[in-house]
């Protein structure tokens, strides 16, 4: 709150703007007839220093010259960059009660001279854009600094524009509002930037450029694609461009891809034929432009055109598998399964599948279309049957895939040997085997088939399978493999007209079961006890159960229990034991064992055999 200097004046030497590290002398003078009322010698002039409106110092001790009661000069040093406010006040020393009265004030700015502007870069966006230049101003000056951008060119013309930097705004870019047109393509322009403030001035080095150096074409617009005869692989990409463009870069990719296909097109005039597109695929297309074959800059990429290529008829063959179940003495149920074509083979939306079952000798043919990936029919058990399936989209159908229907596990000599299943990690199982020992006919291929061992899995869930060439003896199965679930795995060896199989159970990860089997009944027959149980609920098995254990001991005995270990069979739910004494009460229970360990015990049952036991 400085009054408008009624009492006196404050002056600065050498100037109110000084370079960093310089000292300044501040003189405070009272106007005539101003000051303390009684006598001038009681006038005391003090100088206060403020930074950001905060009093930081009383410069009483920095007085270098004093006309008592009239004026004082103070030397200030070590001023920091930016603005510092100094206020001179009058202190009437005889009156302790009155606060000092403001006389006048001054602001001193400390800064540096501007550095020469560097890295000047000019750009004109599009043929009808305007020239804008930017530069690097160098170190902050802490002072108001004016910049003049000067562009000299043909017709003896110079264009200039100014802006300034201070503590509120930065000036390092100017748009001159002038357009350079293609008729100036051969002309040279010179640009320079001059910076000036109260402490000095500096100029950039001149920077020379041509029209082609600085004009960046606008990105192409109105992009569209026309597919020739509704082809899914050939299309003509069209776009609008600025008139002077001579070179285009096209990039395109399927939407889920991570790498672009790149094409350079010279004198394309807004049109280019693409011949390697994938049918029925979502593509993204972008185009960039350049005004000169060798010099100049590429435009930004255009906005993306996203479109799907048309369908084409499916290619590739379906992977077919089947299951055979006898219904009665003269009928069998055939269930055919097949895997969906991958998108590059389907080349469109598969509308349906054409399924054919044919009896080879009698020429009986069953045909149907289905939208599903399985098909079930009841056929006679007699005769040699073959199946074929093809996939159809709006443009046509794939070539049919044929498979001979044979008794998949009918030929023992074709059964693979030494089948094993090892867990590789959480979600796959490595299956290995040895070829059949005495196969009558050559193995054409192996099929590894797997299904979760859970109630109703045969009816509810289709099998999963892998086709393996005849010279491979292993398969890593991962599709639909989950940890802590036991799978039945079959390895089929198929010849032209026969099949043999071997089965094993496997899991990808296992834990000890959550609980033991539940003993439901203990019965005595012919001097033997039969223990019956219900299997552990599927979610509680936590992998493949290797065997069950039946434990027993005399009631109230502290001795270790005896046990009997039974190989796990899914179909078995009772087992005899014959080493119990008659008329002794026993406690019995069961546990289940996986590769990870033994379950807690199941329920306990007491039983006292009556008859004579061995």
């Amino acid at each position: 709150n400085i009054d408008v200097c009624k009492l006196g004046t404050v002056t600065v030497q050498p100037a109110p703007v000084i370079p960093l590290g310089s000292a300044a002398n501040i003189s405070c003078s009272l106007n005539p007839k101003q000051g303390c009322s009684h006598y001038p010698s009681s006038n005391e002039l003090i100088l206060l220093k403020f930074v950001n409106d905060v009093l930081v110092e009383n410069l009483h001790g920095k007085k270098v010259h004093d006309h008592t009661g009239h004026s004082s000069t103070f030397q200030v040093t070590n001023l920091s960059l930016g603005m510092t406010l100094f206020v001179c006040k009058l202190n009437c020393s005889n009156s302790q009660k009155k606060p000092p009265v403001p006389v006048c004030g001054v602001e001193i700015s400390v800064g540096v001279a501007p550095e020469p502007p560097q890295n000047i870069s000019c750009v004109q966006e599009g043929e009808n854009g305007t020239v804008a230049c930017s530069w690097n101003s160098g170190k902050v000056t802490y002072l108001k600094t004016n910049y003049t951008l000067q562009l000299s060119g043909p017709n003896n013309l110079t264009c200039q524009k100014q802006c300034f930097s201070d503590n509120r705004q930065n000036c390092n870019r100017l748009d001159l509002g002038i357009n350079l047109s293609p008729d100036l393509a051969e002309s040279r322009f010179i640009v320079r930037v001059t910076a000036i403030n109260d402490l000095g001035n500096s100029s950039s080095l001149p920077h020379t450029f041509t029209f082609l150096d600085i004009v960046i074409p606008l990105p192409p617009w109105d992009i569209r694609i026309n597919f020739l005869n509704a082809s899914g692989s050939r299309g003509t990409l069209q776009w609008e461009d600025e008139g002077q463009v001579v070179l285009n870069q096209l990039r395109y990719q399927p939407l889920n891809s991570t790498s672009w296909n790149m094409v350079n097109a010279t004198n394309a005039k807004g049109k280019y034929d693409l011949r390697d597109l994938r049918p029925f695929t979502e593509y993204e297309f972008q185009i960039s432009s350049k005004l000169h074959l060798s010099g100049g800059s590429w435009s930004n990429w255009s906005e993306s055109l996203r479109t799907r290529t048309p369908e084409e008829e499916p290619v590739g063959i379906l992977d077919i598998w089947y299951m055979k179940q006898d219904i009665d003495y003269d009928r069998q149920q055939i269930s055919l399964f097949w895997k969906s074509l991958n998108p590059s083979e389907a080349r469109g939306k598969i509308l349906h599948y054409q399924v054919t079952l044919q009896e080879v000798t009698k020429k009986t043919t069953l045909q149907n279309t289905t939208r599903h990936t399985s098909w079930t029919r009841v056929i006679p058990r007699t005769g040699a049957w073959t199946a074929s399936v093809s996939a159809a989209n709006s443009k046509g159908a794939s070539a049919p895939t044929h498979i001979n229907i044979v008794d998949l596990c009918g030929t023992g000599l074709l059964a693979p040997h030494q089948v094993s299943a090892k867990s590789e990690n959480m979600d796959n199982i490595l299956v290995t085997w040895q070829p059949p020992k005495k196969a009558d006919s050559a193995v054409r291929e192996y099929i590894v088939e797997w299904r979760a061992l859970q109630p109703g899995s045969i009816t509810k869930f289709p099998p999963h399978w892998l086709r393996i060439p005849p010279d491979n003896m292993s398969a890593l199965i991962s599709e639909n493999i989950k940890p802590y679930i036991c799978y039945e795995i079959r390895v089929h060896a198929l010849s032209e007209s026969q099949g043999g199989c071997s089965s094993i159970r496997g899991d990808s990860k296992h834990k000890a079961p959550v609980s033991g089997p539940h003993i439901t009944a203990i019965t005595e027959k012919k001097e033997r006890l039969f223990i019956s149980w219900t299997h552990i609920p599927f979610p509680e098995q936590r992998g493949c159960i290797l065997h069950y254990r039946i434990y027993w001991k005399e009631r109230d005995s502290t001795a270790q229990p005896e046990l009997c270990e039974i190989q796990y069979r899914r179909s078995q739910n009772s087992h005899p034991i014959s080493s119990l004494q008659p008329r002794v009460t026993y406690v019995l229970w069961m546990t289940a064992v996986t590769a990870a360990g033994e379950s807690p015990q199941g329920n306990e049952r007491e039983f006292c055999p009556q008859g004579k036991a061995n």
Partner: nanobody, 127 residues
């Protein structure tokens, strides 16, 4: 319709200064370029300086740069030409003119590109 009115011309001694004014009526200069041209007796009209109203850029013929400067007053919708160190060969009728976009480098100094013209003001520099 834009009307342009020059003023500030007159007789001045060599080495002296004059400030010419160009006031627009009818509409603002907004996105125009306002140029100063001059025509000496028996000579072709020649470009002196111009100002892009919206961009704030100034254009000078190299031979006048340093002696002449162009400026504006937004509130008064007026453009000025400050002429210092005048010489007898600066004697001419000085015209102000306005051109519409686009503003191309090639067109700035060409009088046919300017659609609106004032009546001119006489500047005479005596030796």
């Amino acid at each position: 319709q834009v009307q342009l009115q020059e003023s500030g011309g007159g007789l001045v001694q060599a080495g002296g200064s004059l400030r010419l004014s160009c006031a627009a009526s009818g509409r603002t200069f907004s996105n125009s370029v306002i140029g100063w041209f001059r025509q000496a007796p028996g000579k072709e009209r020649e470009f002196v300086a111009a100002l892009s109203w919206s961009a704030g850029s100034e254009f000078y013929v190299d031979s006048f740069k340093g002696r002449f400067s162009i400026s504006r007053d937004n509130a008064k919708n007026t453009v000025y030409l400050q002429m210092n160190s005048l010489k007898p060969e600066d004697t001419a009728v000085y015209y102000c003119a306005a051109k519409n976009p686009p503003h191309r480098w090639s067109d700035i100094g060409k009088s046919p590109q300017y659609a609106y013209w004032g009546q001119g003001t006489q500047v005479t520099v005596s030796s």
